[in-house]
Interface confidence: low
């Protein structure tokens, strides 16, 4: 339905507070280097303008598109050229090219300082002094560091952030109350950002069809009692929501997400029996809850898939009449029967089925040709099952830190050209699959593990795309969305890699390592491990283990010494020499 003024429509739908929050997120995700105060000023100007349009939709400029209004506002930033370089050229373009240009300049790894958490009393004072500014600052800092963060979900995080401070700043032990909550929000926030980044990559790099296929599979697993028409409607609406958010249309996205939650709750009887609790919650909690809701029970006595998709004489006729609908129905029927499969596995099966029909429906005897198509699925199913079994056994044997180290070595040998910080970050996250998924029973391991790995490998892909250094990474990232993980798994040691020159400075440590948190100390050691492998890619596990054990002992010894700095200097030289000898450097 057309509105005279889009900005007035969204302001009225969303209300002033969410309007302002979403505009702030949008601006911070586009201009990631701009100071907070500049963004607040821009947001206030846009909000005042929106209010004039609410009062009179025919007022000057109120009929302009949101992209035009927001783009014009962003292009008033005086320091655009100095701060952003060629991004300033976007301002010479007309819509919709200008918005596309801004989107292309979003930076997944912006050069921003690490967020340091102040003392609890300092935070509580800031919260009480100016709650509104404090919460806006949270939105701004998260949005600029995570330019694809799902905006309506960030409002939910901000609400929980506010609740944590409201509760804990009046608690007897503020720190004991607040810090675990902030840790939880940080970890959940990083996971939420990474999951959304995969959705946006799916839409932007592989297109709407790829995203819709993913959504059909996931929603069919989650809502196995819903009929195909219902799932299709939800997929269409969900695709619109994510297309908007990934495209920077945050007001439309938030509004449409609210509409979708409303629709789901009004029609929960025909969707899922698990939605009742979610639908009793306020909007932000409701939308989050629906997105995370557990799979409904599978309907009893579902007929065999073979009848409709293999044995029927009408397979090719049905396929030819409406290919995507027929494949969608196949995916729906397969996914609702298999909550134990990962979404990417289901998509591989659907792709295999599609390829088989393309070939067989042109053959002399189509039925004879596709009769054994389900047999082709067996190795595709067994491959992730075996991989997960092996890796969970390794995780249980080693524990998370050493399991991460094993993956660090494995991935550095596969793609040694990738920067050390990226290899450390990605391998650490890959290693978290153990504690996240291996505790689950067999039936839940694969969807947990392989779909999580898809999210983590997408982080590698988007970071690598910014500075491409490895053809192998480019190949695995771009050839097939659903085969990324098998592609990386299949990579062997890169024999073409010329080992890095040895640099003693890389392995020089100082007393500051002693004051680091356990996590930061691990990262330091893991960084050294990656550098070791880059210097000596043919080093055996045993050699690397020996060097790392010596290194751990060295850090422990010097951190206990009276003169720590001298210990690090003297013992460090010995360690470097011993390591070089052990690795034959």
């Amino acid at each position: 339905d057309a509105h005279k003024s889009e900005v007035a429509h969204r302001f009225k739908d969303l209300g002033e507070e969410n309007f302002k929050a979403l505009v702030l997120i949008a601006f911070a995700q586009y201009l990631q280097q701009c100071p907070f105060e500049d963004h607040v000023k821009l947001v206030n100007e846009v909000t005042e303008f929106a209010k004039t349009c609410v009062a009179d939709e025919s007022a000057e400029n109120c009929d302009k598109s949101l992209h035009t209004l927001f783009g014009d506002k962003l292009c008033t930033v005086a320091t655009l050229r100095e701060t952003y370089g060629e991004m300033a050229d976007c301002c010479a373009k007309q819509e919709p090219e200008r918005n596309e240009c801004f989107l292309q300049h979003k930076d997944d790894n912006p050069n921003l300082p690490r967020l340091v958490r102040p003392e609890v009393d300092v935070m509580c004072t800031a919260f009480h002094d100016n709650e509104e500014t404090f919460l806006k600052k949270y939105l701004y800092e998260i949005a600029r560091r995570h330019p694809y963060f799902y905006a309506p979900e960030l409002l939910f995080f901000a609400k929980r952030y506010k609740a944590a401070f409201t509760e804990c700043c009046q608690a007897a032990d503020k720190a004991a109350c607040l810090l675990p909550k902030l840790d939880e929000l940080r970890d959940e926030g990083k996971a939420s950002s990474a999951k959304q980044r995969l959705k946006c990559a799916s839409l932007q790099k592989f297109g709407e069809r790829a995203f819709k296929a993913w959504a059909v599979a996931r929603l069919s697993q989650r809502f196995p009692k819903a009929e195909f028409a219902e799932v299709s409607k939800l997929v269409t609406d969900l695709t619109k929501v994510h297309t908007e958010c990934c495209h920077g249309d945050l007001l439309e996205c938030a509004d449409d997400r609210a509409d979708l939650a409303k629709y789901i709750c009004e029609n929960q009887d025909s969707i899922s029996s698990k939605l009742k609790e979610c639908c009793e919650k306020p909007l932000l909690e409701k939308s989050h809850c629906i997105a995370e809701v557990e799979n409904d029970e599978m309907p009893a006595d579902l007929p065999s898939l073979a009848a409709d998709f293999v044995e029927s004489k009408d397979v090719c006729k049905n396929y030819a009449e409406a290919k995507d609908v027929f494949l969608g129905m196949f995916l729906y029927e397969y996914a609702r029967r298999h909550p134990d499969y990962s979404v990417v596995l289901l998509l591989r099966l659907a792709k295999t089925y599609e390829t088989t029909l393309e070939k067989c429906c042109a053959a002399a005897d189509p039925h004879e040709c596709y009769a054994k198509v389900f047999d082709e699925f067996k190795p595709l199913v067994e491959e992730p099952q075996n991989l997960i079994k092996q890796n969970c056994e390794l995780f249980e044997q080693l524990g998370e830190y050493k399991f991460q180290n094993a993956l660090l070595v494995r991935y550095t040998k596969k793609v040694p050209q990738v920067s050390t910080p990226t290899l450390v970050e990605v391998s650490r996250n890959l290693g978290k699959v153990g504690s996240k998924c291996c505790k689950h029973p067999e039936a839940k391991r694969m969807p947990c593990a392989e779909d999580y790995l898809s999210v983590v490998l997408n982080q590698l892909c988007v970071l690598h795309e910014k500075t491409p250094v490895s053809d192998r990474v480019t190949k695995c990232c771009t050839e097939s969305l659903v085969n990324r993980r098998p592609c990386f798994s299949a990579l062997e040691v890169d024999e073409t890699y010329v080992p890095k020159e040895f640099n003693a400075e890389t392995f020089t440590f100082h007393a500051d390592i002693c004051t680091l948190s356990e996590k930061e100390r691990q990262i330091k050691k893991q960084t050294a491990l990656v550098e070791l492998v880059k210097h000596k890619p043919k080093a055996t596990k045993e050699q690397l283990k020996a060097v790392m054990d010596d290194f751990a002992a060295f850090v422990e010894k010097c951190c206990k010494a009276d003169d720590k700095e001298t210990c690090f200097a003297e013992e460090g030289k010995k360690l470097v020499a011993a390591s070089q000898a052990a690795l034959g450097l």
């Epitope: 302001f11 009225k12 739908d13 969303l14 209300g15 507070e17 969410n18 309007f19 609400k159």
Partner: nanobody, 122 residues
Framework: EVQLVESGGGLVKPGGSLRLSCAAS????????MNWVRQAPGKGLEWVSS????????YYADSVKGRFTISRDNAKNSLYLQMNSLRAEDTAVYYC???????????????WGQGTLVTVSS
């Protein structure tokens, strides 16, 4: 000064209907989400229904879904609750309340009316 004044309560038989009104003043009504909340005798507060600033988003508690209808007239600065098929358990003081956040359904309302009593009894 923000003011919310409810009216329309009274005694009604089970199965009967009532229409509550809430007249708002002292703020830009059309910019705020509005809510109905009730309190049964001796019980805690129970959220009943929410309506977004433009009236496009509407939510109901399960206990009233299909029987109550929330609406608003921004030109008249008024909020309404049409209550049909009333039951004894709907007996309560009904309050209209403003959402300070103008959105988000936080349910921590900043302004409340004085309430209007609805009694459902034969």
């Amino acid at each position: 000064e923000v003011q919310l004044v409810e009216s329309g309560g009274g005694l009604v038989k089970p199965g009967g209907s009532l229409r509550l009104s809430c007249a708002a003043s002292g703020f830009t009504f059309s910019n705020y989400n509005m809510n109905w909340v009730r309190q049964a005798p001796g019980k805690g507060l129970e959220w009943v229904s929410s309506i977004s600033s433009a009236g496009t988003h509407i939510y109901y508690a399960d206990s009233v879904k299909g029987r109550f209808t929330i609406s608003r007239d921004n030109a008249k600065n008024s909020l309404y609750l049409q209550m049909n098929s009333l039951r004894a358990e709907d007996t309560a003081v009904y309050y209209c309340a403003r959402d300070p956040h103008s959105t988000g359904w936080y349910k921590d309302f900043d302004y409340w009316g004085q309430g209007t009593l609805v009694t459902v009894s034969s």
